[in-house]
Structure formats: C-alpha cells, structure tokens
C-alpha cells in the first residue's frame, strides 16, 4: 500500500514531494540558530526559543501552534556555593579539589549562563569517607563486589565510571548498597576513541570535559511532585519527602583529569578482572580507601544544588487531517539542552523544524494529510522527560482514543556510520519499505538504498538480509506514549560502529563541547546524515498520517512474541528443579502466542481483501491496527512501576536505556536463586506468566473478526 494518494489535491503532492522539499542546508541553518546560547530547561533563554519556534511553525503554515506550560520540579547548582569534591588529609585540610567548571570551547569564552557540571536532583550534603571503585555501578558490578569480593559499600563514597547503563540506575544501585555518596566520571576507555583528537581538534572528550545528567529513578512518573497527573495551575503537589524517584545521597560528575587524582591513590583489592580496568594510568584498585601512605586521607563531597518548582514550555503544532482529523500521528523531540545542545537535542530539533517546514509548504499548496499530525518541541527532557510526560498526562484521554503513532526526534546523530532504529514491531515493515526507497548517504553506497547500507553495516542477528531493529527502552520522550499509553512508537538516528559501547553515548555527550562546530566540523559537514534522518523520520510520519490503511503489520508482532517467549522460557529453564518443584509452566504463554500468530495471520489476509472504499470497514480495520499496541497495556502496570504498563516491553530495571521483553516475568526471575522465600518468588513468576499469557491472548482477540 502506498501513501501516494492525494488528499483533496493533485497527485503530485505525495511522499516524493514531501521528501524532495527537505534540504540539508536548511537543517544546517536551523542547527546553527538553535545552538548559539544555552537552552537549559526552566530558563528565560529556553522560553524565548519556545516562542521563536512557535512563531516559525506558524509561518511555515501549521494550522495552530500553542505553548503548553507546566510547573515542575527542576534542579540547579547554587550559583554562589559551587559543587566540588576534595581529598582531605587527617587534619581535614583540602589537599586536592576537583574543577568547578569545564574550560569553555574556543569562541564561547564569553557566553554566560553555562551551567557547571552537576548531577541534577542530587540532594545537598558534604559526606566524607573512604572511596570504593565500583566499575560501571551496574547490578552485576555490585554483585561482584558484595558477593565475590566481600566488599561492603555501606558508609563509603563510591566512584563509578559513566557508560553501559543509565546514570540513575547507577545511583540507585549505590544507594541500595549503602553508599553515602556517588562520584561519576568519564573514563577514556568509554569516552575517548583511539586515534581521534580531543575537542576542539576532534570529537573526543578532553580531560576537563564532564557529562551532566539527571540521576532520577522516575520509572515513567514525570514531574516528581505530580505523578500521574499534569503539573498545572491547580495541581496538588507532594512534599519533597514523598516525591517520586529522587536520590537520597549526594552525587557529582567529574572528568578524567580529576578522576585520575582520586583513582591513582586507591588501595584495597585489585580489580576482579580486566573488564573493571579503564584506560587511565591507575591500578583500578577497588578499595576501600587509599593505599599505604595515603590511607589516612579521605574523600569529601560538597554538594549544594537546589530543587525548585519551575515553569517549562512545550510547543505543540497541529496540521489538521482532512479525512480523519481525530486520528493523531505525533512527531516530537525536545528543545532543552544541558548547554549548547549541538547534538542533544538540537540536531534533532533542527530536523523536526525542517520536517515542519516541508509539511507546511505542501499545506500552503492545498494539500492536507489524511490524519492529523501533531508536532511537539518538548521542554525539560533532560530533567526526566518532564515536558512530554506532563503533556501526555494532561491529554491522556484524547491520546489513548486517538493516538495512532509517536515518532521521536531527539539527537539525529550519535555517529555517522549507519542508521539505528528502535521501534514497535508494528513499524518494522514500514521502516523496511521506506528505507528501500531512500538513498544511502554512506560512502561506498552511492546509488544504493539506505536499506542496503543499513543491512550491510548493521545486520539483524536473526534474519539474514535484514537490518537490526532494536527494542524500545526509555531515556527519551517516547516513554510516556509507548510504555504508559500503548501508542505505537519509533525512533531513528545515525549511529556509530560501536556495538560494545551501545549505551555510553558519544564522547562529548552532555558536555560544554557539544557545539555546532562539533557537528559541522567532525560529524556531518555536508549534513547528509541529518538529511537522511529527516527523510526517515519525516517519511514515517508522512506514511502513518497519509496511507489509507495504517502501515502496521501485526504478523511481525507475532514473530517477536514467539522469540521473547522462547527467551524467557530459556532463562527460567536455568532452574529446572525449582520449575518442577513449584509446577511452573509456560504452556499458557506459548498457547497465547500461537493463538496470536494464527489470528494475526487471518487478520492480515482480511486486510488484503476488504473493500477499502467502504469508509466504515476501513475505519474498523484501521482501529484494530491502531488499538493493537494499546491491547498490550495492563492498567495495573508492572510491579512497583505503575507507569510502565506495557506487558511486552519495559525499560530494563537495571538500565533505563535498554528495553526488556516480558519484563514482568524477567524481573520475577532475576536473581531468584538469592531470594529468601523461594516459594513466594516462584509464585510471583507464575503470576507474571499468567498476566503475560492473558495479555497476549486478549491482544490477539482484538484482531479477531468483530462479529
């Protein structure tokens, strides 16, 4: 099926017209405009940018563009009382202090309001104590420390390297281990690619560069003070003690020059193995404490940041659909940045801007999409996906009834090697078909399709001749739409050839060095990768909004459900004796998956044959497709994570960035051998299998013939 039908206008206004209107030069110009000053959430600069975008989207031709504001909890360093870490001697004298700011990049020395590196939402405090090096502070790292190495982190300050998992999970793990403070640092092993110079001479992280970021564990709650409801004028706010997801111990990030000074003195145990060693010239000893002559020295943190309820602004643009105005396809990305936002988010915001301009051009020529397209410039994503979540909370009733799809548009690039797509299985065929029609921007693939270069460089681990498409996790603004509301979602960007470092980000991520020049000089001088990402994101939106039959293939869900059921069964089968003892069976789940597969197959056959000229039947079939994702939502949510309601996918409990399949069962099985009450633990596994089997069966039935 093609989206090339026109809606009330001449046939020339098709996908090709939309794609041809997208220009690399415009994306470049918009990126420059968006990155000259910082746009930190809650600041006047970011409010002014919201108004500029509102004005320009109106000029581009959208039907309406409104600001949606909320008053949410944000976090800022104290301007007169800076955060830092020191080494103190036995007399309490500070013999070393970490730097208070990053050296500004060339050309930006006189820019004001560059927020110094900090961990957003860290509580205030000045803990002092011995240091323990905890590698990436993952669940498995703490298991190794506590269970194998017999190291107790209680009352210690831990130092963890950034990478592998979301920083909020690191902090949560440290808290659970009893730590009284956390120091986060960027190790060159993770943030300095061999053979590349550091900024400004290359795209690597200099020793004084530091990654900012929030350290919340919101689990999809949005504003910590108003979970489940919008932070509007009449909101009831929780007290700070009842706020969702706030860390309880001070946390602060540093660069690798400062980290060297802390780590070079470490004593105690050698690292357990080479996977705990980074690239600094230090022994990577775990501690606790400093070695030999330095054993009387301690580490002291000085954290004075404050949490403040602050107004944020989303920009919401509407392009009304001509045929189904009550069906919404949403393209959204955030606008707020930690500093200049050269990549995150403005490389994405510039692409959204150009997509809006292209749609606006078509609209001015008399075209309208079949369905309504909503464009969003979200605020306060960096502070916990707050803008998108508050807007979705405010509009949840409309979205759950009318939401067709959400396409995310944060950073367009995290490298320039190949495409990276994470999406619902419903969109697999859409992405495949679209990328087959787009030209590859890659060197060596001139005249070849994007599909071909993508498949060659990032092959699917399961299906030969197909590209890898990953599960949606979180850490971005699609979270509320997919994980809470069950709206089919997807994201696309250009990425690096760095599979082992999947969740560490690019070297200059969230640092002051993430500038326009970083992109223009080192990542994408011709803006050809940005243009390709604009074509993918825009093309997906176009097809979702304009195709007569929604471009969702439910058979692809059947395939992955079987794969996920096999995977979780094999995890459970590592405990054959317990499965026998507690009568644990996956029969109900496999039966439900089998039923889903058969019903999806029959639905797809009907989809080929039905009378598309009958608007009632067309709408009925489209609604079955639209509501399929919704059918995977459990209104009760996952255990202890009420805003993660999707039964098939959730962010991993150990890494917010990663997606986990059948998360309820997975979490029930995780570390089950250590549970004090095995009978209760295996009972929960059985309950989760029941919930999953019921949900898959119920979802299958939504695809059955209606009568």
């Amino acid at each position: 099926k093609s989206s090339n039908e026109a809606t009330n206008i001449t046939p020339k206004h098709n996908m090709k017209a939309f794609l041809d209107e997208l220009k690399a030069e415009n994306i470049k110009k918009f990126l420059y405009n968006f990155t000259q000053i910082p746009h930190l959430a809650g600041t006047e600069q970011n409010f002014q940018l919201a108004k500029q975008i509102q004005s320009q989207w109106k000029e581009f031709g959208l039907d309406s563009v409104e600001l949606a504001h909320y008053d949410v909890l944000l976090s800022y360093p104290n301007k007169t009382h800076p955060n830092y870490i020191s080494i103190i001697n036995e007399d309490g004298n500070e013999i070393f202090n970490t730097s208070l700011f990053e050296p500004p990049p060339p050309g930006y020395e006189n820019v004001s309001d560059i927020v110094p590196p900090f961990s957003a939402f860290s509580p205030q405090g000045m803990p002092e104590g011995d240091l323990v090096y905890v590698n990436y502070a993952r669940t498995e790292d703490f298991f190794k420390l506590e269970r194998d190495m017999k190291i107790n982190c209680s009352g210690k300050i831990v130092i963890a390297r950034y990478g592998k998992v979301f920083r909020g999970n690191k902090v949560k793990n440290a808290q659970l281990a009893g730590a009284k403070g956390v120091i986060l640092y960027s190790d060159p092993a993770d943030y300095f690619a061999p053979g590349v110079k550091s900024y400004p001479d290359g795209w690597n992280l200099p020793g004084g560069g530091v990654q900012r970021g929030n350290i919340l564990n919101l689990n999809g709650a949005g504003d910590p003070l108003t979970p489940g409801y919008p932070a509007n004028e009449y909101a009831y706010r929780r007290g700070i003690a009842e706020a969702v997801g706030l860390p309880s111990i001070p946390v602060h990030p540093i660069g690798y020059y400062d980290a060297q000074k802390l780590l070079e003195k470490m004593g105690g145990s050698a690292p357990p193995d080479s996977s705990w060693r980074g690239s600094l010239k230090v022994p990577y000893n775990v501690g606790p404490g400093f070695t030999g002559n330095f054993s009387t020295q301690k580490v002291k943190m000085h954290i004075h940041s404050t949490n403040e309820v602050t107004r944020i602004y989303n920009v919401i643009g509407t392009l009304r659909g001509a045929v189904e105005p009550d069906r919404y396809v949403i393209l959204g990305g955030h606008r707020d940045s930690w500093v200049f936002g050269g990549i995150d988010p403005q490389s994405g915001a510039a692409v959204v801007h150009e997509i809006v301009r292209s749609f606006g051009t078509l609209k001015k020529e008399g075209w309208r999409p079949r369905r309504t397209i909503l464009f969003a410039s979200w605020d306060a994503e960096e502070f916990g996906l707050l803008g998108s979540t508050e807007w979705a909370e405010e509009n949840s009733r409309l979205l759950q009834e009318r939401g067709v799809a959400y396409i995310n548009a944060d950073s367009s690039i995290e490298g320039n090697y190949t495409l990276r797509v994470d999406c619902t299985p419903l969109m697999y065929s859409l992405v495949h078909n679209l990328t087959k029609e787009l030209k590859s921007p890659d060197e060596g693939f001139e005249g070849k399709s994007l599909y071909e270069s993508w498949t060659k460089k990032s092959p699917s681990p399961e299906f030969s001749g197909m590209p890898r498409i990953s599960k949606l996790g979180s850490g971005n603004d699609f979270e509320v739409f997919f994980q809470r509301l069950g709206i089919a979602s997807g994201r696309a960007r250009y990425t690096k050839n760095w599979e082992t470092n999947k969740f560490s980000g690019y070297p200059l991520y969230h640092s002051v060095y993430e500038t326009y020049e970083l992109v223009e000089k080192f990542y994408d001088p011709m803006f050809k990768y940005h243009l390709t990402v604009a074509q993918v994101r825009g093309g997906m939106v176009f097809e979702l909004a304009n195709s007569i039959v929604l471009p969702f293939d439910c058979r692809d869900y059947a395939v992955v459900l079987r794969k996920y059921a096999d995977k979780i069964y094999s995890i459970s089968m590592k405990h054959p004796q317990e499965m026998k003892t507690y009568s644990v069976s996956f029969d109900s789940l496999f039966s439900a998956v089998k039923n889903f597969t058969e019903i999806a197959s029959k639905f797809s056959e009907r989809l080929q044959d039905f009378d598309k000229s009958n608007p009632i039947v067309l709408r009925m079939m489209n609604d079955q497709l639209m509501f399929l994702e919704r059918a995977f939502i459990d209104p009760l949510g996952l255990p202890d994570r009420p805003f993660y309601r999707h039964v098939i996918y959730a962010p991993s409990s150990h890494n917010k960035y990663a997606g986990e399949s059948f998360p309820g069962i997975y979490d029930a099985l995780f570390d089950i051998e250590s549970k004090v009450d095995p009978s209760k633990a295996w009972g929960e596994v059985k309950r989760q299998i029941y919930v999953a089997a019921f949900t898959v069966q119920a979802a299958a039935e939504t695809l059955s013939e209606v009568a």
């Epitope: 194998d148 190495m149 017999k150 004593g267 193995d273």
Partner: antibody
Framework: EFQLVQSGAEVKKPGASVKVSCKAS????????MNWVRQAPGQRLEWMGL????????DYNQKFKGRVTITRDTSASTAYMELSSLRSEDTAVYYC?????????WGQGTLVTVSS | DIQMTQSPSSLSASVGDRVTITCKAS??????VAWYQQKPGKVPKLLIY???TRHTGVPSRFSGSGSGTDFTLTISSLQPEDVATYYC?????????FGQGTKLEIK
C-alpha cells in the same frame, strides 16, 4: 547445590599440551569469575589466571608467558584451562576456583603429571 | 610481583595452645589479605578475608589481623581438626600471590 567438577587426571609428555575442564552447577555460571590455581607437590599455591565468563575475557599470570589459555563454554557452564609446552615442573594439581580475588569455592583438583 | 613470606614454615603445638602464623608482604597490600586452610589431600578452604573477617562457617577460634605488610593468623585454642597447611594470599595487585604455607601439626 553448588558444585565445581573437574576433569580427570592426565599424564602428558614434555612439550605436549593439556586441557583441563571445570563444570559449574548450582549457580549462574556467567555471574562469577573462574580462576585457575595450581599446586606442585609440596609447593605453594600458584595463581595462573582467570576468566570472566560473561565476556569471555581472560587475565593471566605473566609467569606463564603465553603458555596458558583460559576459555569457557557458557552453554555448557564449563571453564577450560589449557597449558602448552609442558615441562616436568608443570606436574601439579590444577584447581578451578570461583571468585574475584578471593576463592571461597574450589573444584576437586586435577592431577597433571608431565613425564617422559 | 608481590612476594608473600610465611613464618614459621612448620610448627607443632598442643591441643588448646594459642597458635600464631605470620605473613609478610614484600610491599604494602593494605588489608587485602586472605588466609586458607588445606588439610592433607583436600582442597583449600577460605578462612579469613580482608585480613580479619571470618568467612561464613569458620569457627571463632580463628582470627586475623594486620595491614600494610605484616599479617597474622591466630588460632586461640588449637583443636585436633586444625591440623593442616595454612596459606596467606594477597589480592591487592596482580598476579595474585600466595605464601609458601605453614604446616601445623599436633604435638
């Protein structure tokens, strides 16, 4: 119940290689490092190296100068230690031991005799 | 490599005696020292880690102390089942190294 079960005794000629296996059960194999420690008759314990079964990465005691290779098969929950260019002084009991730095759990040992 | 030197190499004591074994590291290892007991024909068994922490199930008559370079294993009241060879091990630096062992016998 947790167990490390090693392969049986071996007699080898000088210059040959030996591969000793260590099958783990009763825990998640990939969660814990596996070390190899040997003990020549009447001698001290000697750490040879370790493997992180999750990543398959190994660290070695440089004393063995590339003669030792530690591998694993996660599907079989088994670690292997191969020692090449055997000499008479390699005659020892070879142990696998679970842990990181500390060895709370040991295999039963495998006697390797190197004799012409 | 860090050398671990135990003394004495062997000792003989009576049931009920207080027995002390020492271990000296060639360079500072903080408190990253463990002690193992190996009975004849058996595998080594972890007794003490972090110089002074008893492993699960180890009788309270076994205790450890020390930091830096000098470490001690003490058996407060020797029992017949304590006949074994005792090894110290440092885990502060790679390669991990053991002492040469102290053989303990009953008089």
């Amino acid at each position: 119940e947790f167990q490390l079960v090693q392969s049986g005794a071996e007699v080898k000629k000088p210059g040959a290689s030996v591969k000793v296996s260590c099958k783990a059960s009763g825990y998640t194999f990939t969660d814990h490092n596996m070390n190899w420690v040997r003990q020549a008759p009447g001698q001290r314990l000697e750490w040879m190296g370790l493997i992180n079964p999750n990543y398959g990465t190994a660290d070695y005691n440089q004393k063995f100068k590339g003669r030792v290779t530690i591998t694993r098969d996660t599907s079989a929950s088994t670690a292997y230690m191969e020692l090449s260019s055997l000499r008479s002084e390699d005659t020892a009991v070879y142990y696998c031991a679970r842990g990181s730095s500390l060895f709370a759990y040991w295999g039963q040992g495998t006697l390797v005799t190197v004799s012409s | 490599d860090i050398q671990m030197t135990q003394s004495p190499s062997s000792l003989s004591a009576s049931v009920g005696d207080r027995v002390t074994i020492t271990c000296k590291a060639s360079q500072g290892v903080d408190t990253a020292v463990a002690w193992y007991q190996q009975k004849p024909g058996k595998v080594p068994k972890l007794l003490i880690y972090w110089a002074s922490t008893r492993h699960t199930g180890v009788p309270s008559r076994f205790s450890g102390s020390g930091s830096g370079t000098d470490f001690t294993l003490t058996i407060s009241s020797l029992q017949p089942e304590d006949v074994a060879t005792y090894y110290c091990q440092q885990y502060s630096r790679y390669p991990l190294t053991f002492g040469q062992g102290t053989k303990l016998e009953i008089k």
